[in-house]
């Protein structure tokens, strides 16, 4: 009985109420190997999630986050509020950088700017909020 | 007793229209998920349409879209398949069918009855 679950293709499932046929997956669900025995019911792209793929019999939907937000995670399991460059989120929401510290993309955390007197530089251009200081020669 | 009944099938010209039935018995259709699958000769079982309250939507095959559409009474608990523009490839049984979620988050569907021929030819 288990060689022909094994013969049925993605897509499908086997049905131990009919014989164990292959029955093709309902609706809104998928299976992406063969011999399952259910298939799985497909993630939805809802609310800040928008749907990057849609769901096909063999495989799941695939979702990004919308305008505004990142994802994070594997698949893109959460989406996270995009801050401006030169600011990080904080449980406040999006917050600028202190003085001495840079962010240069609009996710993470600001980062301190590099000491260039730790490598006997100079400092050729100050930092800001959103850029790192560039250190001159030494 | 779970039962659903389909009726309806029969012979139409290309082009033509029929109305399937499927009479639920043991269970609220309203309250689940549902459709028809179809078996054309020597083929394998085939999703044509479904009402999912899970996902909040109809569902169509792409080949039927435009030309099927599915419904139901809930008074009297009973499934339709609106079917116009027949083709020739519709020929089938048309199964009436209760789409099964499981604990485990598994899906499945189940259904119950002879189902109902449709012939489409001239």
């Known amino acids: 009985l288990q060689d022909l679950c094994s013969n049925c293709p993605a897509g499908t499932f086997c049905d131990n109420n009919r014989s164990q046929i292959c029955s093709p997956c309902p609706p809104n669900s998928f299976s992406s190997a063969g011999g399952q025995r259910t298939c799985d019911i497909c993630r939805q792209c809802k609310g800040v999630f928008k749907t990057r793929k849609e769901c096909s019999s063999t495989s799941n939907a695939e979702c990004d986050c919308i305008s505004g937000y990142h994802c994070l995670g594997a698949e893109c399991s959460m989406c996270e509020q995009d801050c401006k460059q030169g600011q990080e989120l904080t449980k406040k929401g999006c917050k600028d950088c202190c003085f001495g510290t840079f962010n240069d993309q609009k996710r993470g955390i600001c980062r301190p700017w590099t000491n260039c007197s730790l490598d006997g530089k100079s400092v050729l251009v100050n930092g800001t909020k959103e850029r790192d200081v560039v250190c001159g020669p030494s | 007793e779970v039962q659903l009944l389909e009726s309806g099938g029969g012979l139409v010209q290309p082009g033509g229209s029929l109305r399937l039935s499927c009479a639920a018995s043991?269970?609220?259709?309203?309250?689940?998920?549902v459709g028809w699958v179809r078996q054309a000769p020597g083929k394998g079982l085939e999703w044509v349409s479904a009402?999912?309250?899970?996902?909040?939507?109809?569902y169509y095959a792409d080949s039927v879209k435009g030309r099927f559409t599915i419904s139901r009474d809930n008074s009297k608990n009973t499934l339709y398949l609106q079917m116009n523009s027949l083709r020739a490839e519709d020929t089938a049984v048309y199964y009436c069918a209760r789409v099964v979620y499981h604990a485990g988050g598994g899906v499945t569907f189940d259904y119950w009855g002879q189902g109902t021929l449709v012939t489409v030819s001239s």
């Open positions: 009402i999912l309250d899970f996902g909040g939507s109809t």
């Open positions: 043991g269970f609220m259709l309203s309250a689940e998920d």
